[in-house]
């Protein structure tokens, strides 16, 4: 038997992926466990093998279909179960009725690129990946810029309160190396959270023209 507190958290990427993390204090280390998804209105069901990510937590991705296919809607509820093998049978360790559009976490933005760079400013664009068309324009973004000698944690957050897939960074220092990241969040969903940060985009501002004030 397993004692201790259990936490089972899942997010839907809005298209065809549900990612889950299960943590259990005093959990069994060498036991095979899986997440099973059973939607209340659809014909498919799906399973993924939980793999350890730390001493007492496991994670897996339920792949529901092709990455850009819409596999769930706002009317769906998916019963998610953690099942662990006990001898010849499976034991239910955790269960939740999962409302996908109340528990959203999108994929990190992709295709970051410098559109235009000057001495003091830089225009950057990006794209969202595998995001449902249901959101229309109801998305927001956060961005951050890493300056020399600072950490990402120290970088101030810039908030874009609309679906705007570009930003113009101002008041930059000439001839300086920077890095930039962005993340996205739908406005919908009680338990919706920010996507992971994008891969950092490195860029360098142009040097100031010789003999001119900067």
């Amino acid at each position: 038997a397993v004692n201790g507190t259990s936490q089972f958290t899942c997010f839907y990427n809005s298209r065809a992926n549900i990612s889950c993390v299960w943590s259990q204090d005093g959990a069994l280390q060498d036991t095979s466990c899986q997440v099973h998804a059973w939607p209340d209105r659809r014909r498919w069901n799906q399973t993924c093998e939980l793999l350890p990510v730390s001493q007492a937590s496991w994670a897996c991705n339920l792949i529901l279909g092709a990455p850009d296919s819409q596999k769930l809607t706002t009317v769906d509820i998916v019963t998610l179960r953690v099942l662990c093998r006990e001898g010849v049978r499976w034991r239910v360790m955790a269960i939740q009725d999962f409302k996908p559009f109340e528990n959203l976490r999108l994929m990190a933005p992709i295709s970051l690129q410098v559109v235009h760079v000057e001495t003091h400013r830089c225009n950057i664009s990006w794209e969202i990946s595998q995001a449902s068309h249901y959101f229309e324009r109801h998305l927001e973004f956060e961005a951050r810029t890493l300056s020399p000698g600072h950490t990402w944690e120290e970088a101030p957050l810039l908030t874009l309160k609309q679906k705007q897939e570009w930003i113009c960074l101002e008041t930059l220092t000439p001839d300086t190396q920077y890095e930039f990241q962005v993340r996205v969040k739908p406005l919908q969903g009680e338990f919706t959270t920010w996507s992971p940060w994008s891969q950092p985009l490195a860029f360098r501002t142009k040097p100031a023209a010789l003999g001119k004030d900067t």
């Epitope: 209105r41 659809r42 014909r43 819409q70 809607t73 009317v75 449902s132 068309h133």
Partner: antibody, heavy 116, light 107 residues
Framework: QVQLQQPGAELVKPGASVKMSCKAS????????ITWVKQRPGQGLEWIGD????????NYNEKFKSKATLTVDTSSSTAYMQLSSLTSEDSADYYC?????????WGQGTTLTVSS | DIQMTQTTSSLSASLGDRVTINCRAS??????LNWYQQKPDGTLKLLIY???GLHSGVPSRFSGSGSGTDYSLTISNLEEEDIATYFC?????????FGSGTKLEIK
């Protein structure tokens, strides 16, 4: 095999109420939504609402919210739809169906006639 | 509400013909589109679910296709028993809605 049984006909007076039944067999009743659909003579299909027997959760078409009430009796694997304040506009065929990626099994339908 | 439009209300075809029935949604329904057959006696049957999934027991001459807002049901080799009215239906969002139906007759 999956079956949904509905009585063939109901005759009711205007202003009264009727409670029609849909008895399910051949599957786990509490695991699938039951939906109700209206069809006026020679007309198309209209979705009234649905109910999940496992929890009693319901969804209604706004148009039928004050007209229809959906319930279930899990002990007899039966879904019910009560229609209130009946008028001639409610005279129609009413179908129940099981939902599983579309309405995969249908009852034969109950013909409701509202007449004095 | 999502409107489902079947522009052809009736269709006449010969036995053995390939018949296509179209359905258009008022907005993108992400393939959450089903097709039903209603026989003259009122009996309703699911033919196709999620745009192209063939329901169990349905003959393989029935097929579905489409995406976004435009969908179609094809009967590849029309048989006598296919004489019926065909309805499309979206289960992308509540309230679920149906097309007005296409009545298929034999020439």
């Amino acid at each position: 095999q999956v079956q949904l049984q509905q009585p063939g006909a109901e005759l009711v007076k205007p202003g009264a109420s009727v409670k029609m039944s849909c008895k399910a067999s051949g599957y786990t009743f509490t695991s699938h939504w039951i939906t109700w659909v209206k069809q006026r003579p020679g007309q198309g299909l209209e979705w009234i609402g649905d109910i999940y027997p496992g929890s009693g959760n319901t969804n209604y078409n706004e148009k039928f919210k004050s007209k229809a009430t959906l319930t279930v009796d899990t002990s007899s694997s039966t879904a019910y739809m009560q229609l209130s304040s009946l008028t001639s506009e409610d005279s129609a065929d009413y179908y129940c169906a099981r939902e599983r990626g579309g309405f995969d099994y249908w009852g034969q339908g109950t013909t409701l006639t509202v007449s004095s | 509400d999502i409107q489902m439009t079947q522009t052809t209300s009736s269709l006449s075809a010969s036995l053995g013909d390939r018949v296509t029935i179209n359905c258009r949604a008022s907005q993108d329904i992400s393939n959450f589109l089903n097709w039903y057959q209603q026989k003259p006696d009122g009996t309703l049957k699911l033919l196709i679910y999620y745009t192209s999934g063939l329901h169990s027991g349905v003959p393989s001459r029935f097929s579905g296709s489409g995406s976004g807002t435009d969908y179609s049901l094809t009967i590849s080799n029309l048989e006598e028993e296919d004489i019926a009215t065909y309805f499309c239906q979206q289960d992308n969002n509540h309230p679920y809605t149906f097309g007005s139906g296409t009545k298929l007759e034999i020439k």
